[in-house]
């Protein structure tokens, strides 16, 4: 005998009696696809989440992070709070990069500046906390009497914040 | 959704090359960090080191300096692990994870075996 | 570079609190995150940044760090918690991550 069950849509669950009737989803619960014998709790979006979708009998809520916090993980199962470009996150805060590094993003931490002289070339644009340096035309290839902007950056070793 | 798929399982000898490879999808792969773990059989997850594919800045755990190589291709969405001469050793699990600190998304992990 | 110390091996009774320690030279200055790894799968986060419990792990997961020890408890310990577990850490000095060496947890 085929299971009953089967035929209860999404939205419903399958009822433990014997008729098996389809039983509509409760307050805040869902069931996402047909033939489920029990409705799955929504997801609740509290703290630095937020409510990106809400919960409908037939699919899960979807959270997304409060503002100065970016997602990690899959469907946004984690929040980690954002710095400024520039620095990088610590145990004690927000840290500007330390000289000779630099994170042009919100999140993730500081790199060092392009080491140009390790291509043969000068550098064009200084480095900053939120810029990698810019390298030029190698210093042969400039005109007799020219030199690069400054001189070349420190080799590309990782930066000392402690995190 | 996001996805990091790795090479599939390879078997090679003491001493052969070897590169595999994790691509990225689902989100934007020049911007995050990709690091790189190994899982000897039976044994625990050692960090080996990371990447940044936007321009390819890499550091490594001390333990692996010089034993191997790491890379990437941002136009594919690809890094890569690599060898240039494998030893008995190198059996193990390899797994691309994104992140530098928290790994919130893994590879399927991608199986070395040398053996002669 | 830091390392991380964890027990091999832990066991508990289902139901009862199982209690594993990661300890590490100043660990508490530093964020600490902790993986669970069952056979043939790839590790999973189940507590980020001390004590921060990714959404759809179960409440019964909680985490607390400071000076040289990490600690995961797991309250209520149910079957489905039987893996491996892994600390973990990252250090701006050197720009280094690093992994306890994991304890198997056993639900008796």
């Known amino acids: 005998i085929q299971d009953s069950c089967s035929k209860c849509p999404a939205g419903t669950f399958c009822g433990k009696n014997k008729s098996q009737i389809c039983i509509p989803c409760p307050p805040n619960s869902f069931s996402s696809t047909s033939g489920q014998k029990a409705c799955d709790i929504c997801r609740q979006c509290e703290g630095v989440f937020r409510t990106k979708k809400v919960c409908s009998s037939t699919s899960n809520a979807e959270c997304d992070c409060i503002s100065g916090f970016h997602c990690l993980g899959a469907g946004c199962t984690m929040c980690e709070q954002d710095c400024k470009q520039g620095q990088e996150l610590t145990k004690k805060g927000c840290k500007d990069c330390c000289f000779g590094t630099f994170n042009d993003q919100k999140r993730g931490i500081c790199r060092p500046w392009t080491n140009c002289s390790l291509d043969g070339k000068s550098v064009l644009v200084n480095g900053t906390k939120e810029r990698d340096v810019v390298c030029g035309p190698s210093p042969a290839d400039l005109s007799p009497g020219a030199s690069s902007v400054t001189p070349p950056a420190p080799a590309r070793e990782p930066g000392h914040s402690p995190q | 959704q996001v996805q990091l798929v790795q090479s599939g399982a390879e078997v090679k000898k003491p001493g052969e090359s070897l590169k595999i490879s994790c691509k990225g999808s689902g989100y934007s792969f020049s911007t995050y960090w990709i690091s790189w773990v190994r899982q000897m059989p039976g044994k625990g997850l050692e960090w080996m080191g990371k990447i940044y594919p936007g321009d390819s800045y890499t550091n490594y755990s001390p333990s692996f300096q010089g034993q191997v190589t790491i890379s990437a291709d941002k136009s594919i969405s690809t890094a890569y692990l690599q060898w240039s001469s494998l030893k008995a050793s190198d059996t193990a699990m390899y797994y691309c994870a994104r992140g530098y600190g928290i790994f919130d998304y893994w590879g399927q992990g991608t199986l070395v075996t040398v053996s002669s | 570079d830091i390392e991380l110390t964890q027990p091999p091996s832990v066991s508990v009774a289902p139901g009862q609190t199982a209690r594993i320690s990661c300890s590490g030279d100043n660990i508490g200055d530093q964020y600490a995150h902790w993986y669970q790894q069952k056979p043939g799968q790839a590790p999973v986060v189940v507590i980020y940044?001390?004590?921060n419990r990714p959404s759809g792990i179960p409440e019964r997961f909680s985490g607390s760090n400071s000076g040289n020890t990490a600690t995961l408890t797991i309250s209520g310990t149910q079957a489905e918690d039987e893996a491996d577990y892994y600390c973990a850490t990252y250090t701006g000095f050197g720009s280094l991550a690093v992994f306890g060496g994991g304890t198997k947890l056993t639900v008796l």
């Open positions: 940044q001390d004590k």
